[in-house]
Amino acid sequence: QLTTESMPFNVAEGKEVLLLVHNLPQQLFGYSWYKGERVDGNRQIVGYAIGTQQATPGPANSGRETIYPNASLLIQNVTQNDTGFYTLQVIKSDLVNEEATGQFHVYPELPKPSISSNNSNPVEDKDAVAFTCEPETQDTTYLWWINNQSLPVSPRLQLSNGNRTLTLLSVTRNDTGPYECEIQNPVSANRSDPVTLNVTYGPDTPTISPSDTYYRPGANLSLSCYAASNPPAQYSWLINGTFQQSTQELFIPNITVNNSGSYTCHANNSVTGCNRTTVKTIIVTELSPVVAKPQIKASKTTVTGDKDSVNLTCSTNDTGISIRWFFKNQSLPSSERMKLSQGNTTLSINPVKREDAGTYWCEVFNPISKNQSDPIMLNVNYNALPQENGLSPG
């Protein structure tokens, strides 16, 4: 059976396509190619007489067609108007004609696309942004890329207009991109230049650093305030409610106890119109802001119940501190047998009873800090009663 095949089936505009003929009968007078799905003299492209080896152009000939002795038809410099069906009619020497129809599709070489946006400076959690991939072309697939990855599944991302438009609902600061669109057809593909979003947001609640609260007299107080914000926030400082200065950093040299108080950082974004504040308490004191870990010792760790006594001692090199004791997570003393002495440095238990067995630890603290010792284990034993060795009467 007479058949035709397009090589290639999908053709780039400006390129060429060859309509190949298979199973051409042997004894022929000639053949004709037509544009369309049927033989129509008004749409004849070319005829070829085998006897004279002469090609005759038809009404639909554009000058770009070449017919070969094997009936194949070459069309050069194709346009999108060439897309469609082509019919070959073979005039056989028995005067019975055969026909075969083939087709091909011409696609344009796609240009480099560009991205247009309805809002390039959206406000976080408030605005939506619609990106559109330009130009609009027929038979084209539109793809989108965010951060060089295909679109994630998200209820905030919507595709429309044949995927040509990407809408971000309620943008966040993480939606800056970059965004790229890609257009594809069966013969070409092209990607746009990246586009980034300038998402306006903030300020978030400011953070004051360093995190220290306690300072010694004579030290320099240097505080820095930062709030995530776009555009960057404008900062101001208040001490105990009184405005000080409009800077991101606050510096006070050689502080005294009089500089103790509440330090407020105020962050403002003039575009969003939002303000945020953070308050930090600063304490200037001679007291050590950090208390060292105390050591705990016992006069003995294994004692005999109802007989022995024990002394537990909590040692520290810090001054201006207080000491408290704990047994099984409970504060001591918890009974008449327990006594504290030497400024709570020593815990005495006399006499020790079975219920006194367990872990003990001490804690040292001042108004601004505290620390606790490692636990110590107290074991309480009781002497066993002597066994009676008697023979039972036999």
Epitope: G30, S32, G41, N42, A49, G51, I91, L95
Partner: antibody
């Protein structure tokens, strides 16, 4: 069944005009080249004109060029011959004939019964 | 005068083989296909041979065609009385851009 039926012949004065028609049936008219062939009384066959299946290619015998015009209406399956400036030597039976080879191996496989044109004063 | 030359007449008895010649030039017979037509008295011509030697369906194989150079021949074997008719050769002429016929040969079946 293939049929070709000519009409429009008759008596006409020299210099006059006539239009012949050939109604085709029994085949796909638009797929075939068509010709007019004439035969003067007692004489041999003389080819007059041919028109391709789409009407894009037309040829005439030197003896009729400029006076006779061939045309076709594929929607009506009809072939025409417009005859102007007629002369006595145009007197003949006019046949329409089908070429099944689209002109690649010109031949006439079916003929009409003919229509007589007489040019006389 | 016809472009293709045929003998004006030919004759033969029933059962005989008769040959009719047709002479032309390189612009017609030499480079194009030859056809032969039979015209019975008072009727339209009928195609007997096309493409030099091919017979349409329905034409008896007593009719055969051949071509050599710028000449063609129609042979009728086993001649019958109903073969009495005028016979024309025809071909496309590339110089004239038109179809040309021979002057015709009147075949008589003697009887």
């Amino acid at each position: 069944e293939v049929q070709l039926l000519e009409s429009g012949g008759g008596l006409v004065q020299p210099g006059g005009s006539l239009r012949l028609s050939c109604a085709a049936s029994g085949f796909t008219f638009s797929n075939y080249a068509m010709s007019w062939v004439r035969q003067a009384p007692g004489k041999g066959l003389e080819w007059v004109s041919v028109i391709s299946h789409g009407g894009g290619s037309i040829y005439y015998a030197d003896s009729v060029k400029g006076r006779l015009t061939i045309s076709r209406d594929n929607s009506k399956n009809t072939l025409y011959l417009q005859m102007n400036s007629l002369r006595a030597e145009d007197t003949a039976v006019y046949y329409c004939a089908r070429d099944p080879t689209k002109g690649y191996a010109p031949t006439f496989d079916y003929w009409g019964q003919g229509t007589l044109v007489t040019v006389s004063s | 005068q016809s472009v293709l030359t045929q003998p004006p007449s030919a004759s033969g008895t029933p059962g005989q083989r008769v040959t009719i010649s047709c002479s032309g030039s390189s612009s017609n017979i030499g480079n194009n296909y030859v056809s032969w037509y039979q015209q019975l008295p008072g009727t339209a011509p009928k195609l007997l041979i096309y493409a030099d030697s091919k017979r349409p369906s329905g034409v008896p194989d007593r009719f055969s065609g051949s071509k050599s150079g710028t000449s063609a021949s129609l042979a009728i074997s086993g001649l019958r009385s109903e073969d009495e008719a005028d016979y024309y050769c025809g071909a496309w002429d590339a110089s004239l851009n038109g179809y040309v016929f021979g002057g015709g040969t009147k075949l008589t079946v003697l009887g």
